[in-house]
Interface confidence: low
């Protein structure tokens, strides 16, 4: 009689909750951070002509006991974003990272001949949509 | 993605079998009785992140660009060995109303690992 029954999730390991009780959160909680980055900074400006810059998102923060509740449970059609992490695997610590399958491409205009001709391409897996303790 | 073979300590996929009985879920999952969930393990040295073939490659390349130059905020950002590809699995289970449901459940199996 909770979402967990009607939408089963995968347990990824045994040895439930191999952490000391009351382990404090080590860092700020896992969240997505935005940063404006120019292709010039990256040294890609000779290849990528437009846009000159883009909003880059990356995942940052720790995976302590409680993560803010703005991360929702998985429902069909939406990526799962876990809430209360406990490391279950021997020696494994959950890591704040982009959720698999949710990275998006960036559509760019490129040149390979110094600007005489242009192509429209996609830079795959550049934009982070969702972060989670994984 | 690499398979862990005991010879390498860089990020790889480790086989792991989960028994639903062992975690107390056999009262509502009818079949299967367990499955190979797998997990990711290993180190992520800076040259590994962003290697082509990884589904995180361009993203990791951008972060590494700044990380290797010691730029904030990326200087202290740790690269992690995480799932980069997951696979669904078909399951038979009881729902809230004790109805038997057969469903392909997303994200059940770790298929590939990579460095974030």
């Amino acid at each position: 009689s909770t979402p967990l029954m009607s939408w089963p999730w995968s347990p990824s390991a045994l040895r439930l909750l191999q952490r000391p009780p009351e382990e404090p959160a080590a860092h700020a909680n896992c969240h997505r951070v935005a940063l404006n980055i120019s292709f010039q900074e990256l040294g890609w400006e000779r290849w990528i002509v437009y846009p000159p810059s883009f909003i880059f998102h990356y995942c940052h923060g720790g995976c302590g006991l409680h993560i803010p509740p703005n991360l929702s449970l998985p429902v069909p059609g939406a990526p799962p974003t876990p809430a209360q992490p406990y490391s279950l695997l021997p020696g494994a610590q959950p890591c704040c990272a982009a959720l698999p399958g949710t990275m998006r491409p960036l559509h760019v205009r490129t040149t390979s001949d110094g600007g005489y001709s242009f192509k429209y391409e996609t830079v795959p897996n550049l934009l982070t949509q969702h972060c989670a303790c994984i | 993605g690499l398979e862990c073979d005991g010879k390498v300590n860089i990020c790889c996929k480790k086989q792991f079998f989960v028994s639903f009985k062992d975690i107390g879920w056999n009262d509502w999952i009818i079949a299967p009785s367990g499955y190979h969930a797998n997990y990711c393990e290993g180190e992520c040295p800076s040259h590994i992140a962003g290697t082509s073939g990884s589904s995180l490659s361009f993203h990791s390349t951008v972060i590494n660009h700044y990380r290797m130059r010691g730029h904030s905020p990326f200087a202290n950002l740790k690269s992690c060995c995480v799932p980069t590809k997951l696979r669904p699995m078909s399951m038979l289970y009881y729902d809230d109303g004790q109805n038997i449901i057969k469903k392909d459940i997303q994200n059940m199996i770790v298929e590939e690992c990579g460095c974030s």
Epitope: T2, P3, L4, W9, A83, Q84 | -
Partner: antibody, heavy 126, light 108 residues
Framework: QVQLQESGPGLVKPSETLSLTCTVS????????WSWIRQPPGKGLEWIGY???????SFNPSLKSRVSMSVGTSKNQFSLKLSSVTAADTAVYYC????????????????????WGQGTMVTVSS | EIVLTQSPGTLSLSPGERATLSCRAS???????LAWYQQKPGQAPRLLIY???SRATGIPDRFSGSGSGTDFTLTISRLEPEDFAVYYC?????????FGQGTKVEIK
């Protein structure tokens, strides 16, 4: 059908320790957040804390310094101890289950309180 | 901690009428972590709604939940005599798990 039953003394003296036990019957004890919640007479509900069958705990910061929880040896009981009680601790004490799930990465998450005990009234008085 | 404020404190309605109960959070709560409970005198609370909008097993469809972020609503479409009780909202996404102070639905 999972059922919960609280047991323990109905009267505790001030400054003493309140001890209650919750017995779980008819279902699996593993993989859930076994919780204690209390309700002072005529007032609202207050979450005290939870324990997992492995012994991991989380408590309400307002009571943390006085609370301890443990799992019974038979693994179908969990208990609450609240030390240095005062009249303000007079309440109906409920045990409840918050069902849990595990995400694909081995992360346990809580659900709502789907099963409750009937509650036991504890009065703190000399 | 996340403080949940319920309004109104008391709702006086007649059987057959529609009841709308509000629960406001002091900070954003994922809708997946908000529940509603019904409590009658001398009884333990009973789970009505979990995940803000999903009905628990055996709960009649006149009960519905909605909302996201900081504002959540429990609606009882047509009040039955057995629905007069105290209703609590609760969040379980952030520790400490907290309850609202309750809304009493009484017969007018």
């Amino acid at each position: 059908q999972v059922q919960l039953q609280e047991s323990g003394p109905g009267l505790v003296k001030p400054s003493e320790t309140l001890s209650l036990t919750c017995t779980v019957s008819g279902g699996s004890f593993s993989s859930h957040f076994w919780s204690w919640i209390r309700q002072p007479p005529g007032k609202g509900l207050e979450w005290i804390g939870y324990i997992l069958y492995t012994g991991g705990t989380s408590f309400n910061p307002s009571l943390k310094s006085r609370v301890s929880m443990s799992v019974g040896t038979s693994k179908n009981q969990f208990s609450l101890k609240l030390s240095s009680v005062t009249a303000a601790d007079t309440a109906v004490y409920y045990c409840a289950r918050a069902r849990s799930g595990i995400t694909f990465t081995g992360i346990i998450v809580p659900g709502s309180f789907d099963i409750w005990g009937q509650g036991t009234m504890v009065t703190v008085s000399s | 901690e996340i403080v949940l404020t319920q309004s109104p404190g008391t709702l006086s309605l007649s059987p057959g009428e529609r009841a709308t109960l509000s629960c406001r959070a002091s900070q954003s709560v994922s809708s997946s972590y908000l529940a509603w409970y019904q409590q009658k005198p001398g009884q333990a609370p009973r789970l009505l709604i979990y995940g803000a909008s999903s009905r628990a097993t055996g709960i009649p469809d006149r009960f519905s939940g909605s909302g996201s972020g900081t504002d959540f609503t429990l609606t009882i479409s047509r009040l039955e005599p057995e629905d007069f009780a105290v209703y609590y909202c609760q969040q379980y996404g952030s520790s400490p798990w907290t309850f609202g102070q309750g809304t009493k639905v009484e017969i007018k």
